[in-house]
Interface confidence: medium
């Protein structure tokens, strides 16, 4: 049930998309069992969720990846939830780290991030990972979303 | 504070229950510090949360398991959050995967799943795992819930 | 948008703080990109989130830690979300466990906990870990929060 025209529900859940881009920013799509409540939240350039209204949002991301200790850098796999607000510096909101598995050819692991943050109108959130080529894109494994309180 | 009779709070949090059943669907109970806000969400057959009202729900599950690489299949431990709606195919909403530990006799790991999804009246959500015998049922380790936005 | 004076938004997100205390209870601070919606939720003694209003809350914590199997006890690293209410028993709401990594000097891992619980006026929630010295306090790695439904 909607909260009313003055205070509509705002929520999104988008699905990971494999990308040939070399950027560390994950790509997302409105596909499968996705959620996009209305135009008060949008997926921009397949990479960031942008909100039109100021307020408190619960923002979350889940990333499943497959890596091997020998084939990867010594640094762990890190997923970061980042914020970009108009006229402000980018900043990290949340991060999670998992050391690479010794399983061969690679070992799967899942990371979940989530927290409550104040967003300004026009603010965008996106997800960065240390190695996008290790991310698993099978059904349900990697997703990203938010909901306005 | 309730939102009013027209728009009551709808939320549930149920606790894992060990089961002798060989099914991959996890069993849950209204025990311990559980939540069941009202009859607009119910736990059916100890295995699925069913909602009476259409709307956006944040649905989550946490599964802790103990496994060993040598004693398990080569495939990772996978937890899946699944949806069954009246007159529709079952579908996977979220999945997480963790490679088995090399620790002996087994190594504990925890998986967390969560996302925002549109549910129809009569829709049910449930949790599947690759090997229910590996799931940890100690206080607080494995739980499942939802809240209506 | 606020829900109105009768039913204001209540939410918090606090950031981990390294502590010289030997207690297993994690310490938190209102620093960085934190959230504290109003005085209906407060951070007390840097260790617990205390609410003034009864109701259903989604409570979450994320803990990133770095440990090594050889240098740690055989028991896994466990993070517990605990509840303390006036005139009631303390109790564990949620727990997650991760076996220590074999990576050297230590392997990073992240744990996420979250669930919906009924809190009484004056109830406090806090996070316990088996070894606070292993917790990672870099930007975004370890945080704790709640939101009232």
């Amino acid at each position: 049930m909607q909260k009313g025209d003055q205070n509509p529900q705002i929520a999104a859940h988008v699905i990971s998309e494999a990308s040939s881009k070399t950027t560390s920013v994950l790509q997302w799509a409105e596909k499968g069992y996705y959620t996009m409540s209305n135009n008060l939240v949008t997926l921009e350039n397949g990479k960031q969720l942008t909100v039109k209204r100021q307020g408190l949002y619960y923002i979350y991301a889940q990333v499943t990846f497959c890596s091997n200790r020998e084939a990867s850098s010594q640094a762990p796999f890190i997923a970061s939830l980042c914020l970009k607000s108009p006229g402000r510096f980018e900043r990290i909101l949340l991060r999670a780290a998992n050391t690479h598995s010794s399983a061969k050819p690679c070992g799967q692991q899942s990371i979940h991030l989530g927290g409550v943050f104040e967003l300004q109108p026009g603010a965008s959130v996106f997800v960065n990972v240390t190695d996008p080529s290790q991310v698993s894109h099978g059904t349900g494994f990697t997703s990203f979303g938010l909901l306005k309180l | 504070m309730q939102k009013g009779d027209q728009n009551p709070q709808i939320a549930a949090h149920v606790i894992s229950e060990a089961s002798s059943k060989t099914t991959s669907v996890l069993q849950w109970a209204e025990k311990g510090y559980y939540t069941m806000s009202n009859n607009l969400v119910t736990l059916e057959n100890g295995k699925q949360l069913t909602v009476k009202r259409q709307g956006l729900y944040y649905i989550y599950a946490q599964v802790t398991f103990c496994s060993n690489r040598e004693a398990s299949s080569q495939a990772p431990f996978i937890a899946s959050l699944c949806l069954k709606s009246p007159g529709r195919f079952e579908r996977i909403l979220l999945r997480a995967a963790n490679t088995h530990s090399s620790a002996k006799p087994c190594g504990q790991q925890s998986i967390h799943l969560g996302g925002v999804f549109e549910l129809q009246p009569g829709a049910s959500v449930f949790v599947n795992v690759t090997d229910p015998s590996q799931v940890s049922h100690g206080t607080g380790f494995t739980s499942f819930g939802l809240l209506k936005l | 948008m606020q829900k109105g004076d009768q039913n204001p938004q209540i939410a918090a997100h606090v950031i981990s703080e390294a502590s010289s205390k030997t207690t297993s209870v994690l310490q938190w601070a209102e620093k960085g990109y934190y959230t504290m919606s109003n005085n209906l939720v407060t951070l007390e003694n840097g260790k617990q989130l205390t609410v003034k209003r009864q109701g259903l809350y989604y409570i979450y914590a994320q803990v990133t830690f770095c440990s090594n199997r050889e240098a740690s006890s055989q028991a896994p690293f466990i993070a517990s979300l605990c509840l303390k209410s006036p005139g009631r028993f303390e109790r564990i709401l949620l727990r997650a466990a991760n076996t220590h990594s074999s990576a050297k000097p230590c392997g990073q891992q992240s744990i996420h906990l979250g669930g919906v619980f009924e809190l009484q006026p004056g109830a406090s929630v806090f996070v316990n870990v088996t070894d606070p010295s292993q917790v990672s306090h870099g930007t975004g790695f370890t945080s704790f929060g709640l939101l009232k439904l």
Epitope: - | G32, Y33 | S85, G87, R88, F89, R91, I92, Q120
Partner: nanobody, 117 residues
Framework: EVQLVESGGGLVQPGGSLRLSCAAS????????MGWFRQAPGKEREFVAS???????YYADSVKGRFTISADNSKNTAYLQMNSLKPEDTAVYYC???????????WGQGTLVTVSS
């Protein structure tokens, strides 16, 4: 009928020890969390320690490392071993059964512990 009967209180010197017992009847101890609260003169009743049916134990910060809670299901009795007692531990100690979501559902009548030289 559910009943909780405490015993073992008394006068003890600082640094001394006492063991409180809580004999339960009318229910099976192993199905419930059990615990101890205390109320000092002029203060609110406060949580001391508890043990769940799973065997998990909890302690107030003020007693950690000094007090130990245990239960003997065969005797349907819960215990509180109190070591290194301090004057500030002086209070009436109450045994309680946990109704879980709804808090304590049964209390004992209390036993007085006085720590004084």
């Amino acid at each position: 009928e559910v009943q909780l009967v405490e015993s073992g209180g008394g006068l003890v010197q600082p640094g001394g020890s006492l063991r409180l017992s809580c004999a339960a009847s009318g229910f099976t101890l192993g199905n419930y969390a059990m615990g101890w609260f205390r109320q000092a003169p002029g203060k609110e009743r406060e949580f001391v320690a508890s043990i769940t049916s799973y065997g998990d134990t909890y302690y107030a910060d003020s007693v950690k490392g000094r007090f130990t809670i245990s239960a003997d299901n065969s005797k349907n009795t819960a215990y509180l071993q109190m070591n290194s007692l301090k004057p500030e531990d002086t209070a009436v100690y109450y045994c309680a059964r946990d109704g879980y979501t709804y808090g304590v559902d049964y209390w004992g009548q209390g036993t007085l512990v006085t720590v004084s030289s």
